[in-house]
């Protein structure tokens, strides 16, 4: 797996242990928690990152639970089951045998049940809406400059193909980034929009997953773009199945 050969680290994932014990003495990096080998030339899957996050010693964890604003992913952190490719398994269960179905970004999409709960397939999240509010500035950002800067960010920092950034909307102080990626559109080697959104979310919170890189310094024409709150909405290819009780709550 690609990794910086000189000091054997994983540029795209600091939640790894890297050692020169790969084939031919090459650097090999394994995700904390799962021990799965990761490709350090691209983003690590959200499932492996969550697993690594949960495996970190409690006293060493610098990470916090999702804020009260996370309206959709409101179950907080959990230790997920990942498949051999690092994707979320469709059914997740906790230590007390409570189970639920998740989508491809690991967000619960059914009511919780017991071990008899069936999740026939991993439903793909094909549309992600990232809703940001920026801190007050002297004036509004230029929409086209903001659009260009956010597209550049997703292309260069997260290696997401530009075609998957569907739109950037702006009505001061709210910025909305739309990511769209159908199953049929995603080719081998393409970064998943769910992974890109997760890296972005962690960057925005000042919890960068990149090794040794400075935190995210977002600027539009030299003006700092400082985010004060983030909401992320996930739309699945197949609508979620919640009971009416939850829907009316």
């Amino acid at each position: 797996h690609t990794a910086a050969q000189d000091n054997c680290t994983c540029p795209t994932n600091k939640m790894t242990v890297c050692s020169p014990d790969g084939p031919g003495g090459r650097c090999q990096c394994r995700a904390l928690g799962s021990g799965m080998a990761v490709d350090c030339s691209t983003l690590t899957s959200k499932c492996l990152l969550l697993k690594a996050r949960m495996s970190a010693p409690k006293n060493a964890r610098t990470l916090v639970r999702p804020s009260e604003h996370a309206l959709v992913d409101n179950d907080g952190l959990y230790d997920p089951d990942c498949d051999p490719e690092g994707r979320f398994k469709a059914r997740q269960c906790n230590q007390t045998s409570v189970c639920w179905c998740v989508n491809s970004v690991g967000v619960r999409r059914t009511d919780k049940g017991d071990l008899s709960l069936r999740c026939d397939e991993l439903v793909r999240t094909h549309h992600i809406l990232i809703d940001l509010r920026h801190r007050p500035t002297a004036g509004a950002f230029n929409h086209s400059d903001l659009d260009a800067e956010l597209r550049r960010l997703f292309r260069e920092r997260y290696r997401l193909h530009p075609k998957f950034v569907a739109a950037v909307h702006y009505e001061q102080p709210t910025i909305q980034i739309e990511l769209r990626q159908n199953t049929s559109q995603k080719a081998a080697g393409d970064v998943d929009i769910g992974d890109a959104a997760y890296y972005f979310e962690r960057d925005i919170k000042g919890e960068s997953l990149f090794q040794g890189r400075g935190g995210l310094d977002l600027r539009v024409r030299g003006e700092p773009l400082q985010v004060e709150r983030t909401l992320i909405y996930y739309l699945d290819e197949i609508p979620p199945k919640f009971s009416m009780k939850r829907l009316t709550a």
Partner: antibody, heavy 117, light 107 residues
Framework: EVQLVQSGAEVKKPGASVKVSCKAS????????INWVRQAPGQGLEWMGN????????NYNQKFKDRVTMTRDTSTSTVYMELSSLRSEDTAVYYC??????????WGQGTLVTVSS | EIVLTQSPATLSLSPGERATLSCRAS??????IAWYQQKPGQAPRLLIE???ESISGIPARFSGSGSGTDFTLTISSLEPEDFAVYYC?????????FGGGTKVEIK
């Protein structure tokens, strides 16, 4: 030549702890994972966990998580495996093994730990 | 955790015969499998890594194949010193796990 030399056999009483050492030579000690594998009499191989000597990152098999501690001393290129609250079923040969290229390439000679009252 | 199931548990063969040992993983592990030989009173010895890559110093009669969930160790023509227990082991993810072993005994 890569060598892993383990400490000698131990006899312990139930409830006690045992600390087995594994001294590495012939390669860069900090560059390769050291794993611990045990084998009860007449049984198969069981992975207990591993340690990466460069930064002391440890990863334990859930079965032993509350009882096992792996440490290292880079000055002597030695890794230690301590198992506490011993019971009779912990009677086994304990092996350390250097891991590279996705396999346990080099093994220590094994340390027999007998737990008996 | 990934469970490895080896079969048969015992294989009774004569020197010169071909031995075929199987190892099945509970989920797809690509080629992250290794094979070991263990003789009584000795530590295991690595024979094959990455499912099919031979280790220097290991006789050419030992070969491995397979990927995904089904793996095979083949000993093309058994020598007297090959009668031992053979284990498969996965390194796809932690916890690393071993199969229960296959004992190759003299018929």
């Amino acid at each position: 030549e890569v060598q892993l030399v383990q400490s000698g056999a131990e006899v312990k009483k139930p409830g006690a702890s045992v600390k087995v050492s594994c001294k590495a030579s012939g390669y860069t000690f900090t560059s390769y994972w050291i794993n611990w594998v045990r084998q009860a009499p007449g049984q198969g191989l069981e992975w207990m966990g591993n340690i990466y000597p460069s930064n002391s990152y440890t990863n334990y098999n859930q079965k032993f998580k509350d009882r096992v501690t792996m440490t290292r001393d880079t000055s002597t290129s030695t890794v230690y495996m301590e198992l506490s609250s011993l019971r009779s079923e912990d009677t086994a040969v304990y092996y350390c093994s250097s891991y590279r290229s996705d396999a346990f390439a080099y093994w220590g000679q094994g340390t027999l730990v007998t737990v008996s009252s | 955790e990934i469970v490895l199931t080896q079969s048969p548990a015992t294989l009774s063969l004569s020197p010169g015969e071909r031995a075929t040992l199987s190892c099945r993983a509970s989920q797809n592990i690509g080629t992250s499998i290794a094979w070991y030989q263990q003789k009584p009173g000795q530590a295991p010895r690595l024979l094959i890594e990455f499912a099919s890559e031979s280790i220097s110093g290991i006789p050419a009669r030992f070969s491995g194949s397979g990927s995904g969930t089904d793996f095979t160790l083949t000993i093309s023509s058994l020598e007297p010193e090959d009668f031992a227990v053979y284990y498969c082991q996965q390194s796809n993810s932690w916890p690393f796990t071993f199969g229960g072993g296959t004992k190759v005994e003299i018929k």
